[in-house]
């Protein structure tokens, strides 16, 4: 008999957590688990519970997490890693659309995230999408071209900036940009 199947690990309400706001990490295995172990990777820090409630997000809690569980003497495979990001660590960037936020279907638009600081990483979020578009960029501006725009691209976008040296410490979100596809 091999290792037990891996549990799932999720952050509620989101893995992007503003500083000082609460978040819950939940490790979900099968019923009747004897012991859970939730660990912060690249550290010696852990918790022996399925649920880790963080009452106020801090820089020191940002990072990669994973969990596993034990039944009898058997340990499960580890969960997929969860990246817990602290936002609001730095000032917000600005997000703009070129040539503009109103685009004809089939046209092209580029969303640009600009910051005064020398960040080399940018993430673009569309409201309602689970994951960001990440764009490593060497300069002070990150461009996210959207080629052949469709109605599915319409919505509210925000961007974040951060440094590859501290990849889990992000800026505050930019002001929202509403992309309208006509």
């Amino acid at each position: 008999s091999g290792p037990l199947p891996k549990p799932s690990l999720q952050a509620l309400p989101s893995s992007l957590v503003p500083l000082e706001k609460p978040v819950t990490l939940r490790c979900q295995g099968p019923p009747g688990v004897d012991l859970y172990r939730l660990e912060k990777l690249s550290s010696s820090r852990y918790q022996d519970q399925a649920v880790l409630f963080i009452p106020a997000m801090k820089r020191s809690l940002a990072g990669r997490y994973r969990c596993s569980y034990q039944n009898g003497s058997l340990w499960s495979l580890p969960s997929d890693q969860l990246e817990l990001v602290a936002t609001g660590v730095f000032a917000k960037p600005s997000l703009s659309a070129q040539p503009g936020p109103a685009v004809s279907s089939g046209g092209d638009v580029t969303l640009q995230c600009q910051t005064r600081y020398g960040f080399d990483q940018f993430a673009l979020y569309k409201e309602g999408d689970p994951a960001p578009y990440k764009n490593p960029e060497r300069w002070y501006r990150a461009s996210f071209p959207i080629i052949t725009v469709t109605a599915a691209h319409s919505g509210t976008y925000r961007c974040y900036s951060f440094s590859s040296r501290d990849p889990y410490l992000w800026s505050a979100p930019s002001d929202p940009l509403e992309l309208v596809v006509t």
């Epitope: 912060k40 550290s43 010696s44 820090r45 852990y46 918790q47 022996d48 519970q49 880790l52 409630f53 963080i54 009452p55 106020a56 801090k58 020191s60 809690l61």
Partner: nanobody, 126 residues
């Protein structure tokens, strides 16, 4: 709002005792790592005592072993540091700290603590 508030510091003569308290609000200390740290003028912050592992093991810095005792009262949501036989070299600002994560470290590492009090001054002088 998450807060830690220390009390109990002050001026004490060498050989005297003080009991520092740290009251937590906005969360419960149960199942949290707890620690006391201190910083003397011109020196780095150092770990005095902590209970950082899930098995309740207690750590004390060599300089305070046998004189200081860390404890907690979950019902009062408060942690304590009982300090006896105080010496002039114990003079420092004392900070309580806590974390929702335990640690396998065999000492108190301040980077592993997430929530901090504002500090209370302890001065040992005749």
């Amino acid at each position: 709002q998450v807060q830690l508030q220390e009390s109990g510091g002050g001026l004490v003569q060498p050989g005297g005792s003080l009991r520092l308290s740290c009251a937590a609000s906005g969360f419960t200390l149960d199942n949290y790592a707890i620690g006391w740290f201190r910083q003397a003028p011109g020196k780095e912050r150092e770990g005095v005592s902590c209970i950082s592992s899930s098995d309740g093991r207690t750590y004390y810095a060599d300089s305070v072993k046998g004189r200081f005792t860390i404890s907690r009262d979950n019902a009062k949501n408060t942690m304590y540091l009982q300090m006896n036989s105080l010496k002039p070299e114990d003079t420092a600002v004392y900070y309580c700290a806590t974390s929702p994560l335990y640690s396998d470290s065999d000492r108190c590492i301040w980077e592993e603590y997430d929530y901090w009090g504002q500090g209370t001054q302890v001065t040992v002088s005749s």
